[in-house]
């Protein structure tokens, strides 16, 4: 079949990095600068992606593959192939319509992206709070009070977790 196809369609012989030039008797011509073809048999080359503005070039365009972008420091990629850049916040914050805002009491975010999430409610698992939560860190649950000998624990039960601030607010 491949042999038959190549006899019928000379363009199928054009490798990646070239295009089948109808203006030149279907000769395989190299992709022009700033363009590429990632598969054989193409009749046109695709324009290379340009990583401008908040986007930085992670991988240069070649004749056979598109450029790849990432985001400038202080931003992170979103979407397929890093189609968007979103600003980072600090740990203990979330990005809202009003910019980066601190996590509400009872919630935390240990990353520079994403939303604040409620602290773990240790008592739901019958455990006690070993280390209190902060805006940046979840609580650490310890053994259940029943596992501790009487008077051995001065651990306080967790404060009830409030709803996380949802991004956007």
């Amino acid at each position: 079949f491949e042999r038959t196809r190549s006899l019928q369609d000379p363009c199928s012989n054009c490798p990646a990095g070239t295009f089948c030039d109808n203006n030149r008797n279907q000769i395989c011509s190299p992709c022009p600068p700033n363009s590429f073809s990632s598969a054989g048999g193409q009749r046109t080359c695709d324009i290379c992606r340009q990583c401008k503005g908040v986007f930085r070039t992670r991988k240069e365009c070649s004749s056979t593959s598109n450029a790849e972008c990432d985001c400038t420091p202080g931003f992170h990629c979103l979407g397929a192939g890093c189609s968007m850049c979103e600003q980072d916040c600090k740990q203990g914050q979330e990005l809202t319509k009003k910019g980066c805002k601190d996590c509400c009491f009872g919630t935390f975010n240990d990353q520079k992206r994403g939303i604040c999430r409620p602290w773990t409610n240790c008592s739901l698992d019958g455990k006690s709070v070993l280390v209190n939560g902060t805006k940046e860190r979840d609580v650490v649950c310890g053994p259940s009070p029943a596992d501790l000998s009487p008077g051995a624990s001065s651990v306080t039960p967790p404060a009830p977790a409030r709803e996380p601030g949802h991004s956007p607010q």
């Epitope: 189609s83 968007m84 850049c85 979103e86 600003q87 956007p168």
Partner: nanobody, 123 residues
């Protein structure tokens, strides 16, 4: 080609005013949130303000709230930033950017960026 072009920057004295413009082309301007960012010398990019597709919602970074006003004219495919009571710390390159699809609903990602216009506040 999708493009954003800023203008209106310049040298202004503390307490003065400037109006920045951003001309959009190559896309349906009225379908996107639009955003202003700035980058002070030697510092990272900082979000300044953004405005909803129809102009009905506007939000500002705390330090510019009450001094800066973001607006848009969808008929002219233009975004504006009116800057009053300017301070030395407002000195920066100001960029406009387009909010990507789904902006404010599920993310705050931008996908198109202008070349910037320089604002210098100095006596």
């Amino acid at each position: 080609e999708v493009q954003l072009v800023e203008s209106g920057g310049g040298l202004v004295q503390p307490g003065g005013s400037l109006r920045l413009s951003c001309a959009a082309s190559g896309f349906t301007f009225s379908s996107h949130w639009m955003t202003w960012f700035r980058q002070a010398p030697g510092k990272g990019l900082e979000w300044v303000a953004h405005i909803k597709e129809d102009g009905s919602e506007k939000y500002y970074e705390d330090s510019v709230e009450g001094r800066f006003t973001v607006s848009r004219d969808n008929a002219k495919n233009s975004l504006y930033l009116q800057m009053n009571s300017l301070r030395a710390e407002d000195t920066a390159v100001y960029y406009c950017a387009r909010g990507g699809d789904g902006y404010s609903d599920s993310h705050f990602g931008v996908d198109v960026w202008g070349q910037g216009t320089t604002v210098t506040v100095s006596s």
